[in-house]
Interface confidence: medium
């Protein structure tokens, strides 16, 4: 019979013959012959292959380097790579999460609208009228101005987006 020019799914062509690919989690040891099946071996402890393949070497699991702020989100298997994420307080610099940076701080006059996650940075917002922030923080929201009235005091100094109001005693000398 004519040697095949194409093979079925999960097969590959070698030496004019169709051999079975190795399943995910296994690597190729030797191609099939007329008389023998493809020989495959499981990947080692810290290795993986995630497709039907004819690779002679498995891929190393990704290393989540703690010096780059990374930690393991999902441990790799023989068929899947390790997934890294950032430690709390840090977020990934890229979709591949190869390293982490510290969450951005919001400057005085701005508060945190949304605390950063492992994949997105802090979202800051200007403190609106009636609110202030006098800190540089990646976590603190804008705080409302103190209500002098509820303390039976009066406003002695108006608040800004960076400072609270200053309350003082009522002026007793009222005409």
């Amino acid at each position: 019979p004519e040697p095949p020019t194409a093979c079925r799914e999960k097969q590959y062509l070698i030496n004019s013959q169709c051999c079975s690919l190795c399943q995910p989690g296994q690597k190729l040891v030797s191609d099939c012959t007329e008389f023998t099946e493809t020989e495959c071996l499981p990947c080692g402890e810290s290795e993986f292959l995630d497709t039907w393949n004819r690779e002679t070497h498995c891929h190393q699991h990704k290393y989540c380097d703690p010096n780059l702020g990374l930690r393991v989100q999902q441990k790799g298997t023989s068929e899947t790579d390790t997934i890294c994420t950032c430690e709390e307080g840090w977020h990934c610099t890229s979709e591949a999460c190869e390293s982490c940076v510290l969450h951005r701080s919001c400057s005085p006059g701005f508060g945190v609208k949304q605390i950063a996650t492992g994949v997105s940075d802090t979202i800051c917002e200007p403190c609106p009228v009636g609110f202030f922030s006098n800190v540089s923080s990646a976590f603190e929201k804008c705080h409302p101005w103190t209500s002098c009235e509820t303390k039976d005091l009066v406003v002695q100094q108006a608040g800004t987006n960076k400072t609270d109001v200053v309350c003082g005693p009522q002026d007793r000398l009222r005409a």
């Epitope: 780059l68 702020g69 390293s99 982490c100 940076v101 510290l102 800190v135 540089s136 976590f139 603190e140």
Partner: nanobody, 121 residues
Framework: EVQLLESGGGLVQPGGSLRLSCAAS????????MQWVRQAPGRGLEWVST????????YYTDSVKGRFTTSRDNSKNTLYLQMNSLRAEDTAVYYC??????????????WGQGTLVTVSS
């Protein structure tokens, strides 16, 4: 000039406790998030904990969660790290750092001299 002075380190047995302090001066302490980082012998820097300016929010690296507690007293310009159930792997020089506006890891803008914690029997 910004100054951070850590203290409270020492030799402690596994399972023991220590309380580290960091006295801050030269900047408005209450106006900044702060953090603890550590460096074990022959290792890179490792972030340990962050505390927000008001002390409301705290974050910890996985290996110390439930064992370490970070707090601050803004009236005393002091940052604390309460370390319980200490393990040999906690042995390191501990530094407090001011959380700057933006930096990459391992590039902290203000440093103290650190305080050495040794956990050994």
């Amino acid at each position: 000039e910004v100054q951070l002075l850590e203290s409270g380190g020492g030799l402690v047995q596994p399972g023991g406790s220590l309380r580290l302090s960091c006295a801050a001066s030269g900047f408005t302490f209450s106006g900044y998030d702060m953090q603890w980082v550590r460096q074990a012998p022959g290792r890179g820097l490792e972030w340990v904990s962050t505390i927000s300016a008001s002390g409301v929010y705290t974050y910890y690296t996985d290996s110390v969660k439930g064992r370490f507690t970070t707090s601050r007293d803004n009236s005393k310009n002091t940052l604390y790290l309460q370390m319980n159930s200490l393990r040999a792997e906690d042995t390191a020089v501990y530094y407090c750092t001011k959380y700057p506006n933006r930096f990459a890891r391992n590039n902290f803008d203000y440093w103290g001299q650190g305080t050495l914690v040794t956990v050994s029997s």
